[in-house]
Amino acid sequence: GSQHIRAEKAMVDGSWLDLAKRSKLEAQPFAHLTINATDIPSGSHKVSLSSWYHDRGWAKISNMTFSNGKLIVNQDGFYYLYANICFRHHETSGDLATEYLQLMVYVTKTSIKIPSSHTLMKGGSTKYWSGNSEFHFYSINVGGFFKLRSGEEISIEVSNPSLLDPDQDATYFGAFKVRDID
Amino acid sequence: GSQHIRAEKAMVDGSWLDLAKRSKLEAQPFAHLTINATDIPSGSHKVSLSSWYHDRGWAKISNMTFSNGKLIVNQDGFYYLYANICFRHHETSGDLATEYLQLMVYVTKTSIKIPSSHTLMKGGSTKYWSGNSEFHFYSINVGGFFKLRSGEEISIEVSNPSLLDPDQDATYFGAFKVRDID
Amino acid sequence: GSQHIRAEKAMVDGSWLDLAKRSKLEAQPFAHLTINATDIPSGSHKVSLSSWYHDRGWAKISNMTFSNGKLIVNQDGFYYLYANICFRHHETSGDLATEYLQLMVYVTKTSIKIPSSHTLMKGGSTKYWSGNSEFHFYSINVGGFFKLRSGEEISIEVSNPSLLDPDQDATYFGAFKVRDID
């Protein structure tokens, strides 16, 4: 009897360990999406960026979905969201349309149930990129902790998309789940 | 028999709790490294910063290693990496080499097995620090979520190192493990 | 006997699950506080911002306390702290007192036991906001990983508070617990 109980205990604890490990991993969705340089919109207007990599280089995704330029939440929770957006211009690319620029990023959340978009985070700067310098560069970083529900979508809007730096280390955004909702 | 089983159960559960607590702590390496002000290189070239504190003031490290300017990963996992780099100049320090500056940070990953370096994150700005102002300041922040393997090394490269702000609240970088690799 | 033990095991494991879940949630305090636009101080001097929302819009708090402009730690641990601060000016608001600005943020920690304040993180930039442009904007982001003890208080200081952007997506700070102290 005692041996049988010990064996059963070990078996149950073993499955507990599996369950704990599995639930721990499942409880932690994440994504790190990098800009797809082949499809950056032109112009200086504010646009939603729709082309991101999710499975090459530094880009990766787990227990979240990427579709139509939006990062879709599959699991309720509190997430840390972040974005890094780099803008650059070299004189060899031709003159800027204007030397006074508004370089901005907006991290937005859309709910399918209530089809409305809300800005979670914004950042950026007005810049004077004069013709006296052959090269200009500027980066924005934003981050914050937000409650996200399954089905909600995260997207990135920027001004002056034609000035985006297309490197994977320069222009990216991401999220990782930190904890459950009580 | 029943009492003996209960006692055994309590003992096993007790060790489970220890194990769970211990493994949880061991599963969460972290580091927050602050600039070592006594050894900031001069010059404007891009340089890998080698001198950081890991055990004084806000600086700390656990289950990671710091050696020769590199933060070494001891445990596979997904980590959130961040860096905050501040540059400053006061006219009392003498004239700048140029008023047009490229103030940049690069967070790089090196694998010992394959001796090559890759930039995970970059940020910064071109700046015009004119002589009309007696003081200039600029900070960069970058952060992102990356898969790191044991033995890989994280280092920080900056341009214009002679302009770095030597305060521990100004120039630092760090990492903390968020989850295991499946 | 065997059935009784199984039932007891299930019950104990059930309570274990509750305990594990509860302790996991309790071990993860967080806060995301957004600027209270109705009470932004005027002036250009460095001030501690005391008015933040904790329970409306994106603002939320759990297992931490907000009191008198300070975020109070209730539970020892290692926390990731972050702040995003936006400054803006439109010519319709009148002329700036000076075109040369120092736009800064300081994230500070105060201990009640030892009544002294220490800056954990700082960021910002000197800016030249000339009258040639009708609108100016600039954002700062800082973040880092810190050991916080119960009773310690986190607060935000900025220069030029009258230029703060009052939107909840623009000016905010927060914290979330990542792990226990060994």
């Epitope: - | 890998s48 940049m104 341009s159 | -």
Partner: antibody, heavy 116, light 108 residues
Framework: SVEESGGRLVTPGTPLTLTCTFS????????INWVRQAPGKGLEWIGY??????TYCASWAKGRFTISKTSSTTVDLKMTSLTTEDTATYFC?????????????WGQGTLVTVSS | VMTQTPASVSGPVGGTVTIKCQAS??????LGWYQQKPGQPPKLLIF???NLESGVPSRFKGSGSGTQFTLTISDLECDDAATYYC???????????AFAGGTEVVVK
């Protein structure tokens, strides 16, 4: 590519300007270094310049040697108060991405002879 | 100050030679290795202490950080006969010379 020019025979005390002409890259994120090598001796770093940070020189070169960007494709090395000790082949080299320990593109060098 | 040892080293074809470079202060991983043959400009082999420059054979291996660095050339070939230099890329402060004195490699 990078190419040095301006090297010649001069008498002691005569000033001389060498020019580095480069193509295929920009000084916006690359640095141009000047390095010299006396006959039968080792390499000696003189200094560098790049658009994003200005000019820095070796301690021995300050005062007598000046590095300056003269156009978007040329960098000059101005030398004054030359002595016989300055006889050397002068190289210009690109520091890729302004990484000073990564001088990946060198010219063939130009010979400066200081003799009375 | 950068110091290189030995001043000269020889090795047989197919053999291995090791060159050491010492910095007077920590320079992290900011070190390059160059090969120079008579009448030619130097050629970059290794940057950032251990990164192999594109097109350079993997027989050349750089290692070390801080103050001690090593260049190892394995499977020696006749074409490897040259002078090798290390160069610090850390600080310009009070720099007399970023390069060390060099090591002549003779292949027998």
């Amino acid at each position: 590519s990078v190419e040095e020019s301006g090297g010649r025979l001069v008498t002691p005390g005569t000033p001389l300007t060498l020019t580095c002409t480069f193509s295929g890259f920009s000084l916006s994120n690359n640095a141009i270094n000047w390095v010299r090598q006396a006959p039968g001796k080792g390499l000696e770093w003189i200094g560098y310049t790049w658009s994003g940070g200005g000019t820095y020189c070796a301690s021995w070169a300050k005062g007598r040697f000046t590095i300056s960007k003269t156009s978007s494709t040329t960098v000059d090395l101005k030398m004054t108060s030359l002595t016989t000790e300055d006889t050397a082949t002068y190289f210009c080299a690109r520091a890729y991405d302004s990484e000073w320990d990564r001088l990946d593109l060198w010219g063939q060098g130009t010979l400066v002879t200081v003799s009375s | 100050v950068m110091t290189q040892t030995p001043a000269s080293v020889s090795g047989p074809v197919g053999g291995t030679v090791t060159i050491k470079c010492q910095a007077s202060q920590s320079i992290g991983s900011n070190l390059g290795w160059y090969q120079q043959k008579p009448g030619q400009p130097p050629k970059l082999l290794i940057f950032s202490a251990s990164n192999l420059e594109s097109g350079v054979p993997s027989r050349f291996k750089g290692s070390g950080s801080g103050t001690q660095f090593t260049l190892t050339i394995s499977d020696l070939e006749c074409d490897d006969a040259a002078t090798y230099y290390c160069q610090q890329g850390y600080t310009t402060n009070n720099v007399l010379n970023a390069f060390a004195g060099g090591t002549e490699v003779v292949v027998k």
